[in-house]
C-alpha cells in the first residue's frame, strides 16, 4: 500500500476553487523529491498537470499552483475556476508518475445551483443581509403579508404585517411594504445564521386567492482564502465586510482547535499578547473595510483566521465574516535575524534589517511600533535622508552591508527607547521584520566626553576610549548628518587609562578638528566595526563659539558627567510623538511607504549608506 494519503473524493461546483492536500512521510528524500498532480487517462497513463519543478499544463495555466511544505510532509494543489471538464480521476504523488508513490483522488465538479420550479434561490454569506422579494396582486394589497419557513413538513410563521416576529429572528428582521405603485413586499433579514438556511414561503392574503412565492435561502460559510507566507515574513489580511457594518466594532480572530475564535486584535483595543509589537490594524475606510498586518511570522501563527464585525469585538453567530487559512513556509527566503537586541542606557544598538536583495534600489525605512489604539508605526528614518527631529544626532540608517541587509544605528539610549521597531522597504511588503530593543543594566562600553564646546579658529581634540574587548575591531570617528555618518581622520593615542581590569589592548582614539569653523558644529560619533558590520557607537555634540582666549582645547572625560544634550532630545518629545502620522502605506495594499511625513519633524534631507554589525549594543 502507498504511504501517500489524501482526500479520496473531492466534490465542488463550477466556478469554485479546491485545495487538495497530499500527505507523505517526511523523510529527507521525500521532502526534496518531485511532487506532482496528474490526471488518469482511460488507458491507465497519468498526464502531469502540475509539478513542484515548475511545470504547469496549458489546461491549468493561470489557475493552479502546487506548494510543498516539507517540514509538515504535505504538499497542496490549488485549482481555481473549476468547470465540469475538471471532473475525473487524478493522482497526487512523489517522484515519477508511473511509480507507486501516489494516491488516487476523485474530483467531481457539478453545475451550480439555479432557479427551481418558480423557487427563487438566494445565496448569501453568513452574517450578511438578504432581502426576499414577494410580489402580490392588487386584490391582496390590503391583506395580511407574511413569511413562513418550512420546518420539516410544517410552515412556521417568521414575520407578518401585523407585527409578529418569530423569537429566532428578533432584532434582525423587518417586513417592508413598498409604496402603492409597486405590488411587492420584501422581508429583510440581517446577521444571517447558518440555521436561517432553508425553504421559505411568502404570502399575501390568507384565503384561497392568496399570492404565494417560494424562496430557497442558502447561507454560505465563507470559503477560506489560502494564504502562503514565509517564516519571519509578513502577511496582510484585507477585510471588506460592507458598508452596513461600517460603524460596528471590527476584529481579527484565530480559530483554535475547538470552535473558539481567539481575538488577535480588534477595534475596541484588545490585542493578543503573542502579537505584541508585530501587528497593526489600519484605520477603516468609509465602506467598513480594514486590513491587519502581522510581521515576524512564526510557525505557530499558521491556522485559520476570521475577520468580522460585531459590537462585542469578537466572533458571534450572525457576525459577517471573511476567512483565511494561513500557511507559514519554514523554508523561508527571509534570513534569520535577531528578534531582540539589547543595549544599556547611554549606549547604542546596531540593528540588522533584511530586505529582498532583488530590490537593492528600494527605499528603506525604520519605524517605531506603538500599541495605542489599534497600533501604528510612525517612521523614524529612511534611506533618502529623512530623520525624525528628536532622533537627530543619534539615529542613522545605513545601506551597508548591502546585498539584502541594511543597518540601523541608534545611540544615546534611554529607557524610553525600549520597544518594538519594524524594518521595511517600499518594495516587497512581505519583507517586514520586527525587532525588540531592550534596555538592560550596564554601562556603555565606549567612553566619550559629554557636550563639548570648540572655539572658532582653534584646534579641538575629542577622545574616545575603547575597551580591550574591541581590540580586533576597526575604530572610527565620523560626523553625523541626515545622510549617514561621514568618516573623519582620527589618531590612535595608545592604551586608554579609562578602564579598570583592562590591559594594553584598550585604546584611546582621538578626533582632531583643526581651525574650527561654524560648519564643524554638530554631532560626532566614535564607533567600532568589522568590515561592513557596525558595532557600538557613542555620540558627542560639538558646539562652536567665539574665541575668548588663545590656545587649543583638549577635552577630557571629566566633562562627561552630563548626558549628551538631552534637552534637545527631551523638549517636545511627547508633543511631536503625538503628531506622528499613521502612514496609510504601511499596509500591503500599496507598495510604497508614504512620503507624507510629520512636517513638525523638520526638513527633509537625505539618508545615505553607512554600515552594520552583530546585534546587541553595549551589553556584549
Amino acid at each position: 500500500k502507498s504511504p501517500i494519503f489524501g482526500p479520496e473524493e473531492v466534490n465542488s461546483v463550477e466556478g469554485n476553487s479546491v485545495s487538495i492536500t497530499c500527505y507523505y512521510p517526511p523523510t529527507s528524500v521525500n521532502r526534496h523529491t518531485r511532487k506532482y498532480w496528474c490526471r488518469q487517462g482511460a488507458r491507465g497513463g497519468c498526464i502531469t498537470l502540475i509539478s513542484s519543478e515548475g511545470y504547469v499544463s496549458s489546461k491549468y495555466a493561470g489557475r493552479a499552483n502546487l506548494t510543498n511544505f516539507p517540514e509538515n510532509g504535505t504538499f497542496v494543489v490549488n485549482i481555481a475556476q473549476l468547470s465540469q471538464d475538471d471532473s475525473g480521476r487524478y493522482k497526487c504523488g512523489l517522484g515519477i508518475n508511473s511509480r507507486g508513490l501516489s494516491f488516487d483522488v476523485s474530483l467531481e465538479v457539478s453545475q451550480g445551483p439555479g432557479l427551481l420550479n418558480d423557487t427563487k434561490v438566494y445565496t448569501v454569506d453568513l452574517g450578511r443581509t438578504v432581502t426576499i422579494n414577494c410580489p402580490f396582486k392588487t386584490e391582496n394589497a390590503q391583506k395580511r403579508k407574511s413569511l413562513y419557513k418550512q420546518i420539516g413538513l410544517y410552515p412556521v410563521l417568521v414575520i407578518d404585517s401585523s407585527g409578529y416576529v418569530n423569537p429566532n429572528y428578533t432584532g434582525r428582521i423587518r417586513l417592508d411594504i413598498q409604496g402603492t405603485g409597486q405590488l411587492l413586499f420584501s422581508v429583510v433579514i440581517n446577521q444571517l445564521r447558518l440555521s436561517d438556511a432553508g425553504q421559505y414561503l411568502c404570502q399575501a392574503g390568507d384565503d384561497s386567492n392568496s399570492n404565494k412565492k417560494n424562496a430557497d435561502l442558502q447561507v454560505l460559510k465563507p470559503e477560506p482564502e489560502l494564504v502562503y507566507e514565509d517564516l519571519r515574513g509578513s502577511v496582510t489580511f484585507h477585510c471588506a465586510l460592507g458598508p452596513e457594518v461600517a460603524n460596528v466594532a471590527k476584529f481579527l480572530c484565530r480559530q483554535s482547535s475547538g470552535e473558539n475564535c481567539d481575538v488577535v486584535v480588534n477595534t475596541l483595543g484588545k490585542r493578543a499578547p503573542a502579537f505584541e509589537g508585530r501587528i497593526l490594524l489600519n484605520p477603516q475606510d468609509k465602506d467598513g473595510s480594514f486590513s491587519v498586518v502581522i510581521t515576524g511570522l512564526r510557525k505557530e501563527d499558521a491556522g485559520r483566521y476570521l475577520c468580522g464585525a460585531h459590537s462585542d469585538g469578537q466572533l458571534q453567530e450572525g457576525s459577517p465574516i471573511q476567512a483565511w487559512q494561513l500557511f507559514v513556509n519554514e523554508e523561508s527566503t527571509i534570513p534569520r535575524s535577531p528578534t531582540v537586541v539589547k543595549g544599556v542606557a547611554g549606549g547604542s544598538v546596531a540593528v540588522l534589517c533584511p530586505y529582498n536583495r532583488k530590490e537593492s534600489k528600494s527605499i528603506k525605512y525604520w519605524c517605531l511600533w506603538e500599541g495605542a489604539q489599534n497600533g501604528r508605526c510612525p517612521l523614524l528614518v529612511d534611506s533618502e535622508g529623512w530623520v525624525k527631529a528628536q532622533y537627530e544626532g543619534r539615529l542613522s540608517l545605513l545601506e551597508e552591508p548591502g546585498n539584502g541587509t541594511f543597518t540601523v544605528i541608534l545611540n544615546q539610549l534611554t529607557s524610553r527607547d525600549a520597544g518594538f521597531y519594524w524594518c521595511l522597504t517600499n518594495g516587497d511588503t512581505l519583507w517586514r521584520t520586527t525587532v525588540e530593543i531592550k534596555i538592560i543594566e550596564g554601562e556603555p562600553n565606549l567612553k566619550v566626553p559629554g557636550n563639548v564646546t570648540a572655539v572658532l579658529g582653534e584646534t579641538l581634540k575629542v577622545p574616545c576610549h575603547f575597551p580591550c574587548k574591541f581590540s580586533s575591531y576597526e575604530k572610527y570617528w565620523c560626523k553625523w548628518n541626515n545622510t549617514g555618518c561621514q568618516a573623519l581622520p582620527s589618531q590612535d593615542e595608545g592604551p586608554s587609562k579609562a578602564f579598570v581590569n583592562c590591559d594594553e589592548n584598550s585604546r584611546l582614539v582621538s578626533l582632531t578638528l583643526n581651525l574650527v569653523t561654524r560648519a564643524d558644529e554638530g554631532w560626532y560619533w566614535c564607533g567600532v566595526k568589522q568590515g561592513h558590520f557596525y558595532g557600538e557607537t557613542a555620540a558627542v555634540y560639538v558646539a562652536v563659539e567665539e574665541r575668548k582666549a588663545a590656545g587649543s582645547r583638549d577635552v577630557s572625560l571629566a566633562k562627561a558627567d552630563a548626558a549628551p544634550d538631552e534637552k534637545v532630545l527631551d523638549s517636545g518629545f511627547r508633543e511631536i510623538e503625538n503628531k506622528a502620522i499613521q502612514d496609510p502605506r504601511l499596509f500591503a495594499e500599496e507598495k510604497a511607504v508614504a512620503d507624507t511625513r510629520d512636517q513638525a519633524d523638520g526638513s527633509r534631507a537625505s539618508v545615505d549608506s553607512g554600515s552594520s554589525e552583530e546585534q546587541g549594543g553595549s551589553s556584549r
Partner: nanobody, 126 residues
Framework: EVQLVESGGGLVQAGDSLRLSCAAS????????MGWFRQAPGKDREFVAT??????????YYADPVKGRFTISRDNAKNTVYLQMNSLKPEDTAVYYC?????????????????WGQGTLVTVSS
C-alpha cells in the same frame, strides 16, 4: 461548545449494511470538519473517515481498511454527518465515535479534533 450525538449502531451479520448518524448542536457555525473514529476492544482508537468542507466544496478522507465499503456524507442544513457502512466484516466491530473541529492539519490524527461524541457500538457477527 459543540455537542455530538451518535445513533444507528447495533448488531448485524457479516456482509450486512448499517448507517450511522451524528447530529451536531451548539456552536456549530465554526465547524468545518466532522469525522468518525473507532475503537475495537483492547485496541487504540483509529481513524475511519473524515469529511471537511469549505463553502460548497467537500473533501472526503478514508482509512485503508474501509476504502470502497464505507461512505461519509453530510447534511449541512441538519448539521448531521453520516457513515454508510456496507459489506461489514467482523473486524469492523468497535465503538464508533463522531468527532468535529474547526480545522485539522491531518485528518488521521485524533488529537487534532476538539469535540467527541459518546460513541455507538457496532457489532458484526460472523
Amino acid at each position: 461548545e459543540v455537542q455530538l450525538v451518535e445513533s444507528g449502531g447495533g448488531l448485524v451479520q457479516a456482509g450486512d449494511s448499517l448507517r450511522l448518524s451524528c447530529a451536531a448542536s451548539g456552536r456549530t457555525f465554526t465547524t468545518y470538519v466532522m469525522g468518525w473514529f473507532r475503537q475495537a476492544p483492547g485496541k487504540d482508537r483509529e481513524f475511519v473517515a473524515t469529511i471537511t468542507w469549505s463553502g460548497s466544496t467537500n473533501y472526503k478522507y478514508y482509512a485503508d481498511p474501509v476504502k470502497g465499503r464505507f461512505t461519509i456524507s453530510r447534511d449541512n442544513a441538519k448539521n448531521t454527518v453520516y457513515l454508510q457502512m456496507n459489506s461489514l466484516k467482523p473486524e469492523d466491530t468497535a465503538v464508533y465515535y463522531c468527532t468535529s473541529s474547526t480545522v485539522v492539519t491531518d485528518p488521521r490524527k485524533l488529537n487534532e479534533y476538539a469535540y467527541w461524541g459518546q460513541g455507538t457500538l457496532v457489532t458484526v457477527s460472523s
